[in-house]
C-alpha cells in the first residue's frame, strides 16, 4: 500500500495573486499526475512536467503562468493507477484562490447551472468565489435564502424548485451569477432496470437490437459495453415514456453485424445522484450464415405395434426460422390424414420441436419417413424406416397329393411383421392328437420329409413340408410365430390307400 503523495507547498489552501505565476510540486512513490480546474477551453497557461531528483521519489510539477480567476479550484495529485472514471479522485489536495476584482465568481460551464435534486435531498448551488473573503448572498424569487456557504463548494441546503442567483459585492461593485435552476427529478433508491433482446442469434448483415429500460427514475446515466464499441459500431437512442409512469428506454443498434459482433452486450445504469448501480447482460451470437441442426430422438429403424399410438420427436436448432415438412416414401404427408399428424412448436428462440404422431398404427403406415428442415441458407433432412409390427396369422394351410407315388406336400401361408418363422409338428397317433404330448417337432434331417420356406413379400411367407410317402393317417400342424404372437393350424393327411380325406382342424 502506497502512502498518499505529498504536495509542496504543504497547505490546504493558498491565495495566489492575479496574473502571477505559481507552481505546485507533487512527490510520490509511483508515477503521479495532477487533476486541476479547467475552463470550457483547455487552459493554455497550465504546464505539467516531470522532474528528476535524487530522493528516489517521482516528482511532477504543475506550473501556472499568468494566473486568472479560472484557475481557482481544487488541485489534486494522485497516483496514475488509482484513478477511475467513476470515483472521486483519491490523492492529496490543495485549493487555490485567484482573487480578481472583476470576476467575483469562478467561471462555470452551462451544465453547472442545472442543479438536480431528488425529493427532499440537500443540494449544492456551486457559486464559488475567487476570493475566500468575499461574502455571498443567495437569492430566489422570494428573496434572500438562508443556507450554509463554503467558498470552495457553494451554497449547501435543501432548495425548492426554481431559479437561484448568487450575489456578491467586491470593492463596492455588485456581481450576480446567471440563474442556477434547481430541478426536482424522480429517483428511487433502487434501480429498476430491465434488458430486452428480442433476438440473441443473428446472421451477418442483420442489425442487432438490444434495449434497456429504467423505470421510475429520471436521474440515470446508462453506458453500453459491447464487442463493436471500440469501432463505434453501435447507434444508441434514448426514448422517454412519461405515461402512465416514467420509463427511459435506451436502445443499442449494431447495423450490418458480423461474426466479430458476437459476445456480451451489457448495459450499466448508474443513478446520477447516488452510488446505485445496476447491470444487465445478454450474450449475442452472430453467424456467418443461417444454419440448421437436426437431432432426432429415435433411431433410423423404428418399429410400432399394430394399433399402437406412437410419437416420433425431432429437435431442431435453426436460424433463420425454418420450414419443416414430413414425407412418407418421398411423398409429402397429407395433413388431412386423421391418423398421421405432424406438429411443430418453438421451444426457444432458435429451438423447434416437430412431432410425427401415429394415432392407430396400421400395416400400411410402414415405410420410410423423412423430416425436411429448410431456411434460406440451409436444408437438412433425416430419414427413418418404420415397421408396423403385426402378429403372425395363418392365411392358408393346404395339401397337394402327388398322385400314385403316395407323396404329399402341405403348404402353410402365413403373414406378419416381422416375417413369421414357420415350424412344423406331427402327430402320428391320430386318436391321441388332442393330447399336446402326442405332437413332435418335425426335424429337418429326416430323410423322407423335406421342409422349405419361401418369403412371398415383405410380410407373407410360405412354408412347405413334403412327405415322400404317407402310409398311415397322420396330423400335421403349422405354427407361425413372430415377436408379437403365434398361430397354428392343423390338417389330417390320409394315406392314399385309405382314400385320403382332408381335414382342417
Amino acid at each position: 500500500q502506497l502512502s498518499l503523495p505529498s504536495i509542496l507547498p504543504n497547505e490546504n489552501e493558498k491565495v495566489v495573486q492575479l496574473n502571477s505565476s505559481f507552481s505546485l510540486r507533487c512527490f510520490g512513490e509511483s508515477e503521479v499526475s495532477w487533476h486541476y480546474p479547467t475552463s470550457e477551453e483547455e487552459n493554455p497557461n497550465v504546464e505539467i512536467r516531470n522532474e528528476e531528483n535524487n530522493s528516489g521519489l517521482f516528482v511532477t510539477v504543475l506550473e501556472v503562468v499568468n494566473a486568472s480567476a479560472a484557475h481557482t479550484g481544487l488541485y489534486t495529485c494522485y497516483y496514475n493507477h488509482t484513478q477511475t472514471d467513476e470515483n472521486e479522485i483519491e490523492g492529496r489536495h490543495i485549493y487555490i484562490y485567484v482573487p480578481d476584482p472583476d470576476v467575483a465568481f469562478v467561471p462555470l460551464g452551462m451544465t453547472d447551472y442545472l442543479v438536480i435534486v431528488e425529493d427532499d435531498d440537500s443540494a449544492i448551488i456551486p457559486c464559488r468565489t475567487t476570493d475566500p473573503e468575499t461574502p455571498v448572498t443567495l437569492l430566489s424569487n422570494d428573496g434572500v435564502v438562508h443556507a450554509s456557504y463554503d467558498s470552495r463548494q457553494g451554497f449547501n441546503g435543501t432548495f425548492s424548485v426554481g431559479p437561484y442567483i448568487c450575489e456578491a459585492t467586491v470593492r463596492g461593485k455588485k456581481f450576480q451569477t446567471i440563474p442556477f435552476n434547481v430541478y426536482a427529478l424522480k429517483a428511487t433508491s433502487e434501480l429498476d432496470l430491465e434488458m430486452e433482446a428480442l433476438k440473441t442469434v443473428y446472421k451477418s448483415g442483420e442489425t442487432i437490437v438490444v434495449t434497456c429500460a429504467v423505470f421510475n427514475n429520471e436521474v440515470v446515466d446508462l453506458q453500453w459495453t459491447y464487442p463493436g464499441e471500440v469501432k463505434g459500431k453501435g447507434i444508441t437512442m434514448l426514448e422517454e415514456i412519461k405515461v402512465p409512469s416514467i420509463k427511459l428506454v435506451y436502445t443499442l443498434r449494431v447495423p450490418e453485424a458480423t461474426v466479430k459482433d458476437s459476445g456480451d452486450y451489457e448495459c450499466a445504469a448508474r443513478q446520477a445522484t447516488k452510488e446505485v448501480k445496476e447491470m444487465k447482460k445478454v450474450t449475442i451470437s452472430v453467424h456467418e450464415k443461417g444454419f440448421i441442426e437436426i437431432k432426432p430422438n429415435f433411431s433410423q429403424l423404428e418399429a410400432v405395434d399394430l394399433h399402437e399410438v406412437k410419437h416420433f420427436v425431432v429437435d431442431v436448432q435453426a436460424y433463420p426460422p425454418p420450414r419443416i415438412s414430413w414425407l412418407k416414401d418421398n411423398l409429402t404427408l397429407i395433413e388431412n390424414l386423421t391418423e398421421i399428424t405432424t406438429d411443430i412448436e418453438r421451444t426457444q428462440e432458435i429451438r423447434y420441436r416437430s412431432k410425427l404422431k401415429l394415432i392407430r398404427a396400421k400395416e400400411e403406415d410402414s415405410g420410410h419417413y423423412t423430416i425436411v428442415v429448410q431456411n434460406e441458407d440451409d436444408v437438412k433432412s433425416y430419414t427413418f424406416e418404420l415397421l408396423t409390427q403385426v402378429p403372425s396369422s395363418i392365411l392358408d394351410l393346404v395339401d397337394d397329393h402327388h398322385g400314385s407315388t403316395g407323396g404329399q406336400t402341405v403348404r402353410c401361408i402365413a403373414e406378419g411383421t416381422p416375417l413369421p418363422d414357420i415350424e412344423w409338428m406331427i402327430c402320428k397317433d391320430i386318436k391321441k392328437c388332442n393330447n399336446e404330448t402326442s405332437w413332435a417337432i418335425l426335424a429337418n434331417n429326416i430323410s423322407n420329409i423335406i421342409t422349405e420356406v419361401h418369403p412371398r413379400d415383405r410380410s407373407t411367407v410360405e412354408g412347405r413340408v413334403t412327405f415322400t410317402r404317407v402310409e398311415e393317417t397322420i396330423a400335421v400342424r403349422c405354427l407361425a410365430k413372430n415377436l408379437l404372437g403365434a398361430e397354428s393350424r392343423e390338417l389330417k393327411l390320409v394315406a392314399p390307400t385309405l382314400r385320403s380325406e382332408l381335414t382342417v382342424a
Epitope: 471500440v230 469501432k231 463505434g232 459500431k233 426514448e239 422517454e240 435506451y250
Partner: antibody, heavy 127, light 107 residues
Framework: QLQLQESGPGLVKPSETLSLTCTVS????????YYWGWLRQSPGKGLEWI?????????YYNPSLRSRLTISVDTSKNQFSLMLSSVTAADTAVYYC???????DGSGNYYGWFDRWDQGTLVTVSS | EIVLTQSPATLSLSPGERATLSCRAS??????LAWYQQKPGQAPRLLIY???NRATGIPARFSGSGSGTDFTLTISSLEPEDFAVYYC?????????FGQGTKVEIK
C-alpha cells in the same frame, strides 16, 4: 414541396416557459419515413439538438434539457410544438424545427440526419 | 457524451483552391457522421451523410471521407458560394451532437 414554418414569441422572461410551434406543409408528420425534431443555435453553445419524435408517439429528448422539455404533436393540424420551462438567459438562441431522415433495418426505424430545416426563430430570454 | 472537435476554427482560402476540413470524435462513431453547411442568416444544410454520401442536390466538388474517429470534408475547388461555416454531426452515441464549426472565409 416540403416546408416547415415556426411560430411563437421572440421574447420570453426568465423562469417562464418558451413555447414554439412548427407547422409542416407538403408532407405528413405521420410518415414512417421521418422523425421530426427541434434544434437550437447560440453563440455560446453552437448547434444543439433539443429533441425529436416519431409518428408512433415515441419522444426523444436531449438529456441536458429533459427535465424542462416537452414535445407535443397535433396530427390534425400537422403541427408539433416545443415547450421549455424555467428558461434562463442561457436558453437564448435561434430555434429550428427540422425533419430527420430515418433508417429502416428490419427491426424498426431509427433516426438519421437533419435533411430539412426551417429558417429559424430567434428567441431571447430577458426581463 | 461524444465530443466532436473541428479544425481549423477558420480556414482562409481563395476561390478555386482546395479546402480540407477535419472533424475528430472523442470516441469512435464508425461512419455515422454528417457534414452541414451554414451561410449567415440561414439554417444549416445537409451536405454529406454517413461519412461519404452526398445528399440530394449537392455538387460533386464536396466529398467526405473517414471512419472511426477521424473525418474529413473536402471541397475540391472552392466556388464563391462555398464560403460559409461547416459543421460535423454524429448520430452514433446519444445524444446526437455537433462540432463547433469551421469557418471557410475568403482570403
Amino acid at each position: 414541396q416540403l416546408q416547415l414554418q415556426e411560430s411563437g414569441p421572440g421574447l420570453v422572461k426568465p423562469s417562464e416557459t418558451l413555447s414554439l410551434t412548427c407547422t409542416v406543409s407538403g408532407g405528413s408528420i405521420q410518415s414512417s419515413s421521418y422523425y421530426w425534431g427541434w434544434l437550437r443555435q447560440s453563440p455560446g453553445k453552437g448547434l444543439e439538438w433539443i429533441g425529436s419524435f416519431f409518428y408512433t408517439g415515441s419522444t426523444y429528448y436531449n438529456p441536458s434539457l429533459r427535465s424542462r422539455l416537452t414535445i407535443s404533436v397535433d396530427t390534425s393540424k400537422n403541427q408539433f410544438s416545443l415547450m421549455l420551462s424555467s428558461v434562463t438567459a442561457a436558453d437564448t438562441a435561434v430555434y429550428y424545427c427540422a425533419r430527420q431522415s430515418t433508417y429502416y433495418d428490419g427491426s424498426g426505424n431509427y433516426y438519421g440526419w437533419f435533411d430539412r430545416w426551417d429558417q429559424g426563430t430567434l428567441v431571447t430570454v430577458s426581463s | 457524451e461524444i465530443v466532436l472537435t473541428q479544425s481549423p476554427a477558420t480556414l482562409s482560402l481563395s476561390p478555386g483552391e482546395r479546402a480540407t476540413l477535419s472533424c475528430r470524435a472523442s470516441q469512435a462513431v464508425s461512419s455515422y457522421l454528417a457534414w452541414y453547411q451554414q451561410k449567415p442568416g440561414q439554417a444549416p444544410r445537409l451536405l454529406i451523410y454517413d461519412a461519404s454520401n452526398r445528399a440530394t442536390g449537392i455538387p460533386a466538388r464536396f466529398s467526405g471521407s473517414g471512419s472511426g474517429t477521424d473525418f474529413t470534408l473536402t471541397i475540391s475547388s472552392l466556388e464563391p458560394e462555398d464560403f460559409a461555416v461547416y459543421y460535423c454531426q454524429q448520430r452514433s452515441n446519444w445524444p446526437p451532437a455537433f462540432g463547433q464549426g469551421t469557418k471557410v472565409e475568403i482570403k
